[in-house]
Amino acid sequence: EQAPGTAPCSRGSSWSADLDKCMDCASCRARPHSDFCLGCAAAPPAPFRLLWP
Protein backbone atom coordinates (compact mmCIF):
# COMPACT_ATOMS: atom_id res chain seq x y z
CA GLU A 1 0.00 0.00 0.00
CA GLN A 2 1.27 3.47 -0.87
CA ALA A 3 2.09 6.07 1.74
CA PRO A 4 -0.21 9.12 1.72
CA GLY A 5 0.86 11.76 -0.76
CA THR A 6 2.93 9.50 -2.98
CA ALA A 7 2.78 9.69 -6.77
CA PRO A 8 -0.21 7.62 -7.97
CA CYS A 9 1.60 5.84 -10.80
CA SER A 10 0.83 2.23 -11.64
CA ARG A 11 3.45 -0.42 -12.30
CA GLY A 12 5.23 0.25 -15.58
CA SER A 13 4.72 3.98 -15.37
CA SER A 14 6.54 6.81 -13.62
CA TRP A 15 5.71 10.35 -12.60
CA SER A 16 6.90 13.17 -14.86
CA ALA A 17 7.81 16.30 -12.94
CA ASP A 18 7.66 18.36 -16.12
CA LEU A 19 4.24 17.12 -17.24
CA ASP A 20 2.86 16.55 -13.71
CA LYS A 21 1.43 13.16 -14.65
CA CYS A 22 2.37 9.50 -14.91
CA MET A 23 4.09 8.38 -18.08
CA ASP A 24 4.62 4.96 -19.63
CA CYS A 25 8.11 3.62 -18.97
CA ALA A 26 8.06 1.76 -22.30
CA SER A 27 8.74 5.08 -24.04
CA CYS A 28 12.13 5.27 -22.29
CA ARG A 29 13.54 2.90 -24.90
CA ALA A 30 13.25 5.69 -27.44
CA ARG A 31 13.83 8.65 -25.10
CA PRO A 32 15.89 7.46 -22.13
CA HIS A 33 16.66 10.96 -20.86
CA SER A 34 13.06 12.02 -20.37
CA ASP A 35 12.64 13.12 -16.78
CA PHE A 36 10.23 10.34 -15.80
CA CYS A 37 12.65 7.63 -16.95
CA LEU A 38 14.60 8.26 -13.76
CA GLY A 39 11.74 6.57 -11.91
CA CYS A 40 11.50 3.54 -14.19
CA ALA A 41 12.98 0.75 -12.12
CA ALA A 42 13.72 -1.94 -14.66
CA ALA A 43 14.45 -1.82 -18.34
CA PRO A 44 11.29 -2.67 -20.27
CA PRO A 45 11.52 -5.94 -22.18
CA ALA A 46 12.77 -5.74 -25.72
CA PRO A 47 10.16 -6.35 -28.42
CA PHE A 48 9.80 -10.03 -29.26
CA ARG A 49 11.50 -10.99 -32.52
CA LEU A 50 11.41 -14.30 -34.36
CA LEU A 51 14.83 -15.88 -34.66
CA TRP A 52 13.97 -17.50 -37.99
CA PRO A 53 12.59 -16.12 -41.23
Epitope: G5, A7, S14, A17, D35, L38, C40, A41, A42, A43
Partner: antibody, heavy 120, light 103 residues
Protein backbone atom coordinates in the same frame (compact mmCIF):
# COMPACT_ATOMS: atom_id res chain seq x y z
CA UNK B 1 18.51 -2.08 7.95
CA UNK B 2 18.47 0.18 4.91
CA UNK B 3 21.87 1.80 4.45
CA UNK B 4 24.35 3.23 1.98
CA UNK B 5 28.07 2.93 2.72
CA UNK B 6 30.46 5.08 0.71
CA UNK B 7 34.13 4.68 -0.14
CA UNK B 8 36.73 6.01 -2.54
CA UNK B 9 37.32 9.62 -1.54
CA UNK B 10 40.71 11.21 -1.04
CA UNK B 11 43.25 13.73 -2.29
CA UNK B 12 43.81 14.04 -6.03
CA UNK B 13 45.72 16.51 -8.20
CA UNK B 14 43.93 18.80 -10.68
CA UNK B 15 43.33 16.91 -13.91
CA UNK B 16 43.33 13.60 -12.07
CA UNK B 17 40.67 10.93 -11.69
CA UNK B 18 38.88 9.24 -8.82
CA UNK B 19 36.09 6.68 -8.50
CA UNK B 20 33.57 6.80 -5.69
CA UNK B 21 31.56 3.77 -4.63
CA UNK B 22 28.31 3.45 -2.70
CA UNK B 23 27.31 0.01 -1.43
CA UNK B 24 23.59 -0.45 -0.77
CA UNK B 25 21.98 -2.91 1.59
CA UNK B 26 18.61 -3.58 3.19
CA UNK B 27 16.48 -2.83 0.12
CA UNK B 28 15.90 -4.03 -3.43
CA UNK B 29 18.57 -1.98 -5.18
CA UNK B 30 17.20 -2.39 -8.72
CA UNK B 31 13.87 -0.88 -7.70
CA UNK B 32 15.34 2.54 -6.97
CA UNK B 33 16.98 5.35 -8.83
CA UNK B 34 20.16 6.62 -7.20
CA UNK B 35 21.89 9.97 -7.12
CA UNK B 36 25.09 11.77 -6.17
CA UNK B 37 24.99 15.12 -4.35
CA UNK B 38 27.98 17.16 -3.24
CA UNK B 39 28.69 19.89 -0.73
CA UNK B 40 31.72 22.14 -0.96
CA UNK B 41 33.21 23.18 2.40
CA UNK B 42 30.90 25.67 4.09
CA UNK B 43 28.52 25.73 1.12
CA UNK B 44 25.10 24.36 0.20
CA UNK B 45 24.02 21.15 -1.50
CA UNK B 46 24.66 20.69 -5.22
CA UNK B 47 23.16 17.84 -7.22
CA UNK B 48 25.74 16.04 -9.39
CA UNK B 49 24.14 13.09 -11.18
CA UNK B 50 21.38 10.49 -11.09
CA UNK B 51 20.68 7.09 -12.63
CA UNK B 52 17.54 4.99 -13.05
CA UNK B 53 17.11 1.60 -11.41
CA UNK B 54 18.04 -0.26 -14.58
CA UNK B 55 20.96 2.04 -15.33
CA UNK B 56 19.43 2.84 -18.71
CA UNK B 57 18.80 6.52 -17.99
CA UNK B 58 21.45 8.89 -16.66
CA UNK B 59 21.33 12.56 -15.79
CA UNK B 60 24.09 15.10 -15.06
CA UNK B 61 24.47 18.63 -13.78
CA UNK B 62 25.97 20.95 -16.39
CA UNK B 63 28.98 21.52 -14.13
CA UNK B 64 30.12 17.87 -14.44
CA UNK B 65 28.75 16.79 -17.81
CA UNK B 66 31.44 15.19 -19.95
CA UNK B 67 33.79 14.74 -16.98
CA UNK B 68 31.82 12.53 -14.56
CA UNK B 69 30.12 9.22 -15.28
CA UNK B 70 27.49 7.62 -13.06
CA UNK B 71 26.97 3.86 -13.23
CA UNK B 72 25.64 1.00 -11.17
CA UNK B 73 26.35 -2.70 -10.79
CA UNK B 74 22.97 -4.12 -9.79
CA UNK B 75 24.17 -7.65 -8.97
CA UNK B 76 26.67 -6.08 -6.57
CA UNK B 77 24.19 -3.53 -5.18
CA UNK B 78 26.75 -0.79 -5.83
CA UNK B 79 26.58 2.71 -7.29
CA UNK B 80 29.64 4.43 -8.78
CA UNK B 81 30.78 7.89 -9.75
CA UNK B 82 33.79 8.04 -12.04
CA UNK B 83 35.30 11.51 -11.85
CA UNK B 84 37.80 12.59 -14.52
CA UNK B 85 39.52 15.90 -15.31
CA UNK B 86 39.04 16.98 -11.72
CA UNK B 87 39.21 20.67 -10.83
CA UNK B 88 39.74 22.54 -7.58
CA UNK B 89 36.05 23.47 -7.60
CA UNK B 90 35.12 19.78 -7.42
CA UNK B 91 36.45 19.68 -3.85
CA UNK B 92 33.50 18.67 -1.70
CA UNK B 93 31.90 16.02 0.44
CA UNK B 94 30.10 13.67 -1.96
CA UNK B 95 26.93 11.90 -0.85
CA UNK B 96 25.11 9.07 -2.55
CA UNK B 97 21.38 8.95 -2.01
CA UNK B 98 18.39 6.77 -2.83
CA UNK B 99 15.81 8.51 -5.01
CA UNK B 100 12.12 7.80 -4.44
CA UNK B 101 10.20 8.30 -7.68
CA UNK B 102 6.90 7.87 -5.84
CA UNK B 103 8.06 10.59 -3.44
CA UNK B 104 8.27 12.92 -6.44
CA UNK B 105 12.02 12.30 -6.66
CA UNK B 106 12.86 13.11 -3.08
CA UNK B 107 15.96 11.39 -1.65
CA UNK B 108 15.13 9.44 1.47
CA UNK B 109 18.29 7.48 2.32
CA UNK B 110 21.77 9.03 2.28
CA UNK B 111 25.29 7.72 2.60
CA UNK B 112 27.68 9.03 5.22
CA UNK B 113 29.55 11.19 2.72
CA UNK B 114 33.12 11.00 1.46
CA UNK B 115 35.52 13.92 1.09
CA UNK B 116 37.15 14.56 -2.26
CA UNK B 117 39.96 17.12 -2.21
CA UNK B 118 41.39 18.37 -5.50
CA UNK B 119 44.66 20.17 -4.87
CA UNK B 120 48.21 20.26 -6.14
CA UNK C 1 15.49 28.00 -6.50
CA UNK C 2 15.90 30.94 -4.16
CA UNK C 3 15.50 30.44 -0.42
CA UNK C 4 14.81 33.22 2.04
CA UNK C 5 15.80 34.37 4.48
CA UNK C 6 19.40 33.19 4.43
CA UNK C 7 19.42 33.04 8.22
CA UNK C 8 16.50 32.96 10.63
CA UNK C 9 17.23 33.74 14.29
CA UNK C 10 14.55 32.41 16.61
CA UNK C 11 14.01 30.99 20.07
CA UNK C 12 12.75 27.53 20.98
CA UNK C 13 8.94 27.46 20.95
CA UNK C 14 8.67 30.08 18.21
CA UNK C 15 7.24 29.52 14.74
CA UNK C 16 9.62 29.35 11.75
CA UNK C 17 8.50 30.18 8.23
CA UNK C 18 10.96 29.38 5.45
CA UNK C 19 10.42 30.38 1.83
CA UNK C 20 11.51 28.77 -1.43
CA UNK C 21 10.85 30.53 -4.72
CA UNK C 22 11.31 29.00 -8.16
CA UNK C 23 12.10 30.93 -11.32
CA UNK C 24 9.62 28.76 -13.25
CA UNK C 25 6.51 26.92 -12.13
CA UNK C 26 7.25 23.71 -10.20
CA UNK C 27 4.72 20.92 -9.73
CA UNK C 28 6.15 19.48 -6.49
CA UNK C 29 8.83 20.47 -4.01
CA UNK C 30 11.00 18.58 -1.51
CA UNK C 31 12.51 19.85 1.75
CA UNK C 32 15.56 18.56 3.65
CA UNK C 33 17.13 19.28 7.02
CA UNK C 34 20.89 19.15 7.53
CA UNK C 35 22.82 19.43 10.79
CA UNK C 36 26.59 20.11 10.94
CA UNK C 37 28.68 17.08 10.03
CA UNK C 38 25.63 15.04 9.02
CA UNK C 39 24.03 13.97 5.75
CA UNK C 40 20.78 15.70 4.78
CA UNK C 41 17.50 14.22 6.02
CA UNK C 42 14.31 14.10 3.97
CA UNK C 43 11.55 16.10 5.65
CA UNK C 44 8.81 16.86 3.13
CA UNK C 45 8.14 15.40 -0.31
CA UNK C 46 5.51 16.25 -2.90
CA UNK C 47 5.24 19.78 -1.43
CA UNK C 48 3.26 18.78 1.66
CA UNK C 49 3.74 15.10 2.60
CA UNK C 50 5.88 14.37 5.65
CA UNK C 51 8.51 11.67 5.26
CA UNK C 52 8.53 8.70 7.62
CA UNK C 53 9.27 9.67 11.21
CA UNK C 54 9.01 13.42 10.70
CA UNK C 55 7.05 15.13 13.51
CA UNK C 56 3.84 16.95 12.61
CA UNK C 57 5.24 20.31 13.67
CA UNK C 58 6.83 20.33 10.20
CA UNK C 59 4.53 21.19 7.32
CA UNK C 60 4.96 22.19 3.70
CA UNK C 61 2.70 24.18 1.43
CA UNK C 62 2.66 26.19 -1.77
CA UNK C 63 2.23 25.86 -5.51
CA UNK C 64 3.52 27.32 -8.74
CA UNK C 65 6.62 29.29 -7.84
CA UNK C 66 6.14 29.99 -4.12
CA UNK C 67 6.58 27.33 -1.45
CA UNK C 68 6.81 27.39 2.33
CA UNK C 69 8.17 25.15 5.06
CA UNK C 70 6.65 25.88 8.46
CA UNK C 71 7.87 24.63 11.83
CA UNK C 72 5.08 25.44 14.25
CA UNK C 73 7.02 25.33 17.53
CA UNK C 74 10.78 25.08 17.30
CA UNK C 75 12.41 22.34 19.37
CA UNK C 76 16.13 22.52 20.23
CA UNK C 77 16.86 19.79 17.67
CA UNK C 78 15.27 21.81 14.85
CA UNK C 79 18.09 24.34 14.67
CA UNK C 80 19.77 23.38 11.42
CA UNK C 81 20.01 24.28 7.74
CA UNK C 82 16.99 23.61 5.51
CA UNK C 83 17.12 23.08 1.75
CA UNK C 84 14.38 22.93 -0.86
CA UNK C 85 14.77 20.79 -3.99
CA UNK C 86 12.97 20.44 -7.30
CA UNK C 87 13.17 18.11 -10.31
CA UNK C 88 12.62 19.91 -13.60
CA UNK C 89 13.89 19.50 -17.16
CA UNK C 90 15.65 16.30 -16.07
CA UNK C 91 17.73 18.26 -13.54
CA UNK C 92 17.57 18.09 -9.77
CA UNK C 93 18.14 21.51 -8.23
CA UNK C 94 18.64 22.64 -4.63
CA UNK C 95 17.99 26.02 -3.13
CA UNK C 96 20.81 27.84 -1.36
CA UNK C 97 19.54 26.92 2.10
CA UNK C 98 18.13 28.69 5.13
CA UNK C 99 19.95 28.45 8.45
CA UNK C 100 17.67 28.41 11.47
CA UNK C 101 19.75 29.49 14.45
CA UNK C 102 19.06 30.12 18.10
CA UNK C 103 18.72 33.83 18.78
Amino acid sequence: QVQLVQSGGGLVKPGGSLRLSCAASGFTFTSYAMSWVRQAPGKGLEWVSAISGSGGSTYYADSVKGRFTISRDNPKNTLYLQMNSLRAEDTAVYYCARVRANYYYGMDVWGQGTLVTVSS
Amino acid sequence: LTQSPGTLSLSPGERATLSCRASQSVSRLTWYQQKPGQAPRLLIYGTSSRATGIPNRFSGSGSGTDFTLTITRLEPEDFAVYYCQQFRNSLLTFGGGTKVEIT
